[in-house]
Interface confidence: low
Amino acid sequence: MEDEKPKVNPKLYMCVCEGLSCGNEDHCEGQQCFSSLSINDGFHVYQKGCFQVYEQGKMTCKTPPSPGQAVECCQGDWCNRNITAQLPTKGKSFPGTQNFHLE
């Protein structure tokens, strides 16, 4: 039965959280972890965190990197700890499927 309490919820992972949206916390719990890089007014903005709703992560994680933004997603406790998103270099393309890591 879907509502029965699982002993361990297999879809929730502990993620490293870094960036403005994290407030004072350095971790969060969600269905996917991510590491992102975006260019904002010429500055590189790195963020890490979690998607608490799977659909939200699915949409974002499947987006191929653009010159202004890249997101790498993974599933596994602290899996985003050592992931640093990178913007595509000139002349290289990164298919969206390469942008999703399952641990």
């Epitope: 509502d3 309490k5 002993k7 361990v8 919820n9 929730l12 719990e29 269905q31 608490q52 709703v53």
Partner: antibody
Framework: QVQLQQWGAGLLKPSETLSLTCAVY????????WSWIRQPPGKGLEWLGE???????NNNPSLASRVTISVDTSKSQFSLRLTSVTAADTATYYC?????????WGQGTRVTVSS | IQMTQSPSSLSASVGDRVTITCQAS??????LNWYQQKPGQAPNLLIY???NLLPGVPSRFSGSGSGTDFSFTISSLQPEDIATYYC?????????FGGGTTVAIRR
């Protein structure tokens, strides 16, 4: 980040009903179980019960049928009702968000039951 | 499931190795967490699933054990570690905590 803010009456008389509410900010209701935990002065922690986003509850049998936990997903809130309180129910009450562990906690509400 | 924690209190010097034990009344399949609670604050999850530290938790904290017997260790006690520590299982309902261990600095 998930933040929990709780409120409710802090002073009750014996036989009255304790009512506390916890508001959830920046959190997905479907991602967590929502629990109430209490701690009598100078004592340990006691889990009272939990609810999920669908309203399914599990309560601690030690409190029999005195505990009711409810959820209002439209307001991102969940609540605790404890009926027929006695001095033994004097404690700090915490709301929490958990899956494998109680990861996020409210600030706590000190409830005193005294005639 | 009952969780028996010992000792209920201890006093140690800064730099000492401190160990707290937690015994479950039955096998809890390693579904065991450890919390730190400082005076006037809500508890804080330090370790989940026996030995996994949350990020930001100093590496001097560690957990071990399996089945019914578990331990929590502070390898080198620091003044900021003064708190009460609780174990908690989530193998079955109701979820229960150990009675707590209050750690103080010996002067």
């Amino acid at each position: 980040q998930v933040q929990l803010q709780q409120w409710g009456a802090g002073l009750l008389k014996p036989s009255e009903t304790l009512s506390l509410t916890c508001a959830v900010y920046n959190g997905s209701f479907s991602s967590f179980y929502w629990s109430w935990i209490r701690q009598p002065p100078g004592k340990g922690l006691e889990w009272l019960g939990e609810i999920n986003h669908r309203g399914r509850t599990n309560n601690n049998p030690s409190l029999a049928s005195r505990v009711t936990i409810s959820v209002d997903t439209s307001k991102s809130q969940f609540s605790l009702r404890l009926t027929s309180v006695t001095a033994a129910d004097t404690a700090t009450y915490y709301c929490t968000a958990h899956t494998r562990g109680f990861l996020y906690w409210g600030q706590g509400t000190r409830v005193t039951v005294s005639s | 499931i009952q969780m028996t924690q010992s000792p209920s209190s201890l006093s140690a010097s800064v730099g000492d190795r401190v160990t707290i034990t937690c015994q479950a009344s039955q096998d809890i399949n390693n579904y065991l967490n450890w919390y730190q609670q400082k005076p006037g604050q809500a508890p804080n999850l330090l370790i989940y699933d026996v030995f996994n530290l949350l990020p930001g938790v100093p590496s001097r904290f560690s957990g071990s054990g399996s089945g019914t017997d578990f331990s929590f260790t502070i390898s080198s006690l620091q003044p900021e570690d003064i708190a009460t520590y609780y174990c908690q299982h989530y193998d079955d309902l109701p979820l229960t905590f150990g009675g707590g261990t209050t750690v103080a600095i010996r002067r």
